[in-house]
């Protein structure tokens, strides 16, 4: 629940650099927390909600350790460009429900699309190679109702959250190592 | 009612390790990080590390990495810190605090375990 | 690692008083619009308690009376009329960077 961040200023610095993708993170990742605070207010999520076209989570136990900074800028990116994906899908398929949402949404899109150029940005800075997804993009259908629309936006807000907060930390983890 | 829970105070001896728990309730486990405060007599509050319990994935302040272990058992909504090769200047009061997923500011604190080595 | 240096150390006022307790950090932890700066109060044998955070935000259920200001490496919170139940210590944190590390503390005691 912070004010919005301020354009970064463009630097030849890695950790300037990387300071300006982790405000960018940060200020998305309070976005984030925000509207999916906003979604269980006006449509309360029972348990956990999951979405099997949306990326594994890229953290688990030990893994934060040995993190090296080419493996989280381009797997972020990948992760990113899939929530980009969905956020957009459910612009489009979300249906009336989603409609009231609209303009947060829209919001947190250009916000992902601006740290998604930021990541690029910092990617060719380093000369690291501007990786395509593993997987390939498997097209999405529309809602099979409008509960279902409504889970998919849990879904997709929660992970996008927890993947917003495993870039933080990694990102700031990686700072203290430069 | 949001609350952090943890162990009582344990005496230990030089070398030995210490494992505090901390049981949150009241809140959905996995919404914030679980981070570890450590406040020694007369010295500056000093943060250990943090661990999202949703994925597992800690990390450390550089000064406890390699003595300090984090871990969570998500379906009890508890959180352990285990401190290894103790000495005499880990003789301190331990919180668990609930931290904001990107912000590392503490809004639920446990009541704190006191922990002291002596010989 | 940011150092956060608080001033005065201590400081006896009476209730009804205001307070300006400050957190000076070795350098900047604000940027763009956010300030990583966050306070809490400690009463002897118990827990911090988060008061503000991100410089000025007061946590819920905390008095109107407590506020947070400051950008850069100057940050102030204030307590325009003090109470009973305010005599205690005041930490300032910053979250800018990795590790997050606290101030000395500042403690008010009743004068």
């Known amino acids: 629940p912070g004010p919005p961040a301020g354009s970064p200023r463009v630097s030849s610095d890695p950790r300037a650099d990387l300071d300006s993708a982790v405000l960018l993170t940060r200020s998305l990742l309070a976005d984030t927390r925000q509207l999916a605070a906003q979604m269980r207010d006006k449509f309360p999520a029972d348990g956990d909600h999951s979405l099997d076209s949306l990326p594994t989570l890229a953290m688990s136990a030990g893994t934060l350790g040995s993190l090296q900074l080419p493996g989280v800028l381009t797997r972020l990116r990948v992760d990113l460009m899939s929530y980009l994906r969905h956020v957009q899908w459910l612009r489009r398929a979300g249906g009336p429900s989603l409609k009231t949402l609209e303009p947060e949404l829209g919001a947190l899109q250009a916000r992902l699309e601006r740290l998604l150029r930021r990541l690029q940005l910092l990617m060719s800075r380093l000369a690291l190679p501007q990786a395509a997804p593993d997987q390939p993009v498997i097209p999405l259908g529309p809602p099979a109702s409008a509960w279902g629309s409504i889970r998919a936006a849990h879904a997709i807000l929660g992970g996008l959250h927890l993947t917003l907060d495993w870039a933080v930390r990694g990102l700031l983890l990686l700072k203290t190592r430069l | 009612e949001v609350q952090l829970v943890q162990s009582g105070a344990e005496v230990k001896k030089p070398g030995a390790s210490v494992k505090i728990s901390c049981k949150a309730s009241g809140y959905t486990f996995t919404d914030y990080n679980m981070d570890w405060v450590k406040q020694a007599p007369g010295q500056r509050l000093e943060w250990i590390g943090d661990?999202?319990?949703?994925?597992?994935?800690?990390i450390y302040n550089q000064k406890f990495t390699g003595r300090a272990t984090l871990t969570v058992d998500k379906s009890a909504s508890t959180a352990y810190m285990e401190l290894s090769s103790l000495r005499s200047e880990d003789t301190a009061v331990y919180y668990c605090?609930?931290?904001?997923?990107?912000?590392?500011?503490?809004?639920?604190w446990g009541q704190g375990t006191t922990v002291t080595v002596s010989s | 690692d940011i150092v956060l240096t608080q001033s005065p150390a201590s400081l006896a006022l009476s209730p009804g008083e205001r307070a300006t307790l400050s957190c000076r950090a070795s350098?900047?932890?604000?940027?763009?619009?956010?300030?990583?700066i966050h306070w809490y109060q400690q009463k002897p044998g118990q827990a911090p308690r988060l008061l503000i955070y991100l410089a000025s935000n007061l946590d819920s259920g905390v008095p109107a009376r407590f506020s947070g200001s400051g950008s850069g490496t100057d940050f102030t919170l204030t307590i325009s009329s003090l109470e009973e139940e305010d005599f205690a210590t005041y930490y300032c944190?910053?979250?800018?960077?990795?590790?997050?590390?606290f101030g000395q503390g500042t403690k008010l005691e009743i004068k």
């Open positions: 605090a609930r931290g904001e997923l990107g912000h590392w500011y503490f809004d639920v």
């Open positions: 661990i999202n319990p949703h994925q597992g994935g800690p």
């Open positions: 350098k900047s932890v604000s940027t763009s619009g956010y300030s990583y």
């Open positions: 944190q910053h979250s800018r960077d990795l590790p997050p590390t």
